[in-house]
Amino acid sequence: GITNINCSGHIWVEPATIFKMGMNISIYCQAAIKNCQPRKLHFYKNGIKERFQITRINKTTARLWYKNFLEPHASMYCTAECPKHFQETLICGKDISSGYPPDIPDEVTCVIYEYSGNMTCTWNAGKLTYIDTKYVVHVKSLETEEEQQYLTSSYINISTDSLQGGKKYLVWVQAANALGMEESKQLQIHLDDIVIPSAAVISRAETINATVPKTIIYWDSQTTIEKVSCEMRYKATTNQTWNVKEFDTNFTYVQQSEFYLEPNIKYVFQVRCQETGKRYWQPWSSLFFHKTPETVPQVTSKAFQHDTWNSGLTVASISTGHLTSDNRGDIG
């Protein structure tokens, strides 16, 4: 960057090289060039010469003043007009940054995705800081009082093997950058309560000709958790509102859920699960599209395959659930 150039003088920023966005700042340039008494000192921002708000402080120093500086990053350098030199002489350069101190991290969440071998902790970092901001995740055993710290710039994956202090922990997040430091509230967790089952996936769908045509959705998960609660939501692609069905599920076999849908309509389905009675849900599965037929023939769809026809499918066991309407987005 600009900071690696050989300097014939000094450039500095007040109040600091990294400062709060919107502040008034002063950039000072001091020449120290052999046999050059600068007639003029010039400032450049991102390679463009500044023409205003420059004040000569003394024989070798000038100040450039900015009001309400809003750029997240800028490269500044200054030059001297030396008599008897045919071009400007570079004095020095500096990269400057503006941004914000971190907000207090909130919505700290730690989950263990089944089979991952990690505890994944995330949080809401708040507003964009624009500058390098680091996070320290503190994990303290409530049984041994031993505390571990993990440095990251976003979320953190902590190996469950490293969590040797029992099952109960306090977790909190400290955010810090050049402009400030904040700390979240403490989250109390029990490792058995934060496991999220292996992802549920919709594999295919079929519409069966009957007195009233019905659509069967086939879905499964590789989870070994015995008691799992799931939700399937669906809607016509033209609708805003989701319908939600709830299931108590045993994944020893492929799940089949039946729906009575309008003919000749394109629908979208998603599923998610949680360990029954626990706090955290899986994220909603990928969108699965299925178009119901106009009339008699059977139609089958597979994940990400739209409007696929198939007449030779039979129905195995059916799992039924309770129908609700849902306007919610994804919930963690």
Partner: antibody
Amino acid sequence: QVHLVQSGTEVRKPGASVKVSCKVSGYTLNELAIHWVRQAPGKGLEWMGGFDPEHGEIIYAQRFQGRVTLPEDTSTDTAYLDLFNLRSEDTAVYFCATEAAPFDYWGQGTLVIVSS
Amino acid sequence: DIQMTQSPSTLSASVGDRVTITCRASQSLSSWLAWYQQKPGKAPKLLIYKASSLESGVPSRFSGSGSGTDFTLTISSLQPDDFATYYCQQYDIYPRTFGQGTKVEIK
């Protein structure tokens, strides 16, 4: 264009002090390094001191150290030479000059006569 | 301090002559050397800087050469206005020092 105008002839007794002024125009004093050079009657040029822009300080010739100061008044763009404890051998023409490395503009000179 | 030695001290020449003045430094200056012309009762006038660069407005009959410790001022064809005293000056280090001067007079 730089223009340097110096004060007029001064007559002093040995042991006295003298203040010679050098008024700058065309540029401000903040944009110029002023140096002082003297020339005794019939002799060569002798550098006395001036501002070194590389180190941001006034440097004096060893033989004048402690007997000369080079103050400046940036509000009036005037540089001064203060010479103390005058001796008869200080009789000379005193020049201010701008150092753009080298001295490219000179004042007209100020004659200082030290005589009892 | 760097000692600057000019030669000759006095030089008698005629209009149209080619005149050469030399200046020797007691240590290397790179190219930080200037030449001045001074007439009686006047301030010195810069002719050459950085050993060989001609100051703006100075006639091209003046030229400078050399580097390190040995430098030369040449007037290719002496004119009536050129009869004066010439000084070299080093501006490599402080204190700045001048040669003792070379007086060019009419033969």
